[in-house]
């Protein structure tokens, strides 16, 4: 029978957990990305921010997973109004913030 969308969100959460737990050296060599508003449309915004990080295998799967939650194609250099364009943070902090928010959504049953 059908399975609730929660399982897909759980996969994304588990991938972010893996990244934070397996972090030894600075994630993505300490690359900086634009901070985003964790509101509606955040999946596309998160992808738009992370897509600008290249050569970082640790977040490749996350980038691909996020694409499955964003209806449009996202390319490097593409930005939406959901970015806090005056604030850049390290990828590691970005991942932690996103993880905390997704866990909150998961607990509240907000899967869409």
């Amino acid at each position: 029978g059908p399975v609730p969308p929660s399982t897909a969100l759980r996969e994304l959460i588990e991938e972010l957990v893996n990244i934070t737990q397996n972090q030894k050296a600075p994630l993505c060599n300490g690359s900086m990305v634009w901070s985003i508003n964790l509101t509606a449309g955040m999946y596309c915004a998160a992808l738009e921010s992370l897509i600008n990080v290249s050569g970082c295998s640790a977040i490749e799967k996350t980038q691909r997973m996020l694409s499955g939650f964003c209806p449009h194609k996202v390319s490097a250099g593409q930005f939406s109004s959901l970015h806090v364009r005056d604030t850049k943070i390290e990828v590691a902090q970005f991942v932690k913030d996103l993880l905390l928010h997704l866990k909150k959504l998961f607990r509240e049953g907000q899967f869409n």
Partner: antibody, heavy 123, light 106 residues
């Protein structure tokens, strides 16, 4: 390790039916969309059908719409393809493929393919 | 229905560069994917999201996508790269595969 194992192929007469199965392991099957892709002898790849892992949405190529039915049993980690009213042009190797996550699973990329099962439609 | 067109064959000498094109209406607005298939084997994803390589795919494989054309480039082509290559995209609730290109390493 992610693995997909197809079964159920064989020889069937035109107008006949066949049900293909795909046993999945090594990943959370229920989370991912799954597809069937076929390849006729000496020909290119042709997508047949997909089943979302986000909801119960199913998708079909025009060439099989109304004849083929995709389904899945998440408790058994198994994907199915029920093929009815088979034609000679359905003769092909049928691959089971792991698709992506989320409502827009098609943005992810077909990462993992099974070895395929051969369907021959002939009298 | 949406169509993706590829050249039937491309020949390349070892060490040289092979380029395979995939043409479709406004393809650049969609994600493009590339698969490699060797005789008797299942297809393998070599490029996703236009230009990204899955882990384990050699750096000599690269991709681009803009306008109506996606391109797969194999730099420093090796004998082991001889295979059929297919592009793929999603349009109107269906996956579409390209017509396929046979790459021959002379």
């Amino acid at each position: 390790e992610v693995q997909l194992l197809e079964s159920g192929g064989g020889l069937v007469q035109p107008g006949g039916s066949l049900r293909l199965s795909c046993a999945a392991s090594g990943f959370t099957f229920s989370s991912y969309a799954m597809s069937w892709v076929r390849q006729a002898p000496g020909k290119g790849l042709e997508w047949v059908s997909a089943f979302s892992g986000w909801d119960v949405s199913t998708y079909y190529a025009d060439s099989v719409k109304g004849r083929f039915t995709i389904s899945r049993d998440n408790s058994k980690n198994t994907l199915y393809l029920q093929m009815n009213s088979l034609r000679a042009e359905d003769t092909a190797v049928y691959y089971c493929v792991q698709d992506g996550l989320g409502p827009y699973f098609y943005n992810y990329g077909m990462d993992v393919w099974g070895q395929g099962t051969t369907v021959t439609v002939s009298s | 229905s949406y169509e993706l067109t590829q050249p039937p064959s491309v020949s390349v000498s070892p060490g040289q560069t092979a380029s395979i094109t995939c043409s479709g209406d406004k393809l650049g607005d969609k994600y493009s994917f590339w698969f490699q298939q060797k005789p008797g084997q299942s297809p393998v994803l070599v490029i996703y999201h236009d230009s990204k390589r899955p882990s384990g795919i050699p750096e000599r494989f690269s991709g681009s996508n803009s306008g109506d054309t996606a391109t797969l480039t194999i730099s420093g082509t090796q004998a082991m790269d001889e295979a059929d290559y297919y592009c793929q995209a999603w349009d109107s609730s269906t996956y579409v595969f390209g017509t396929g290109t046979k790459v021959t390493v002379l």
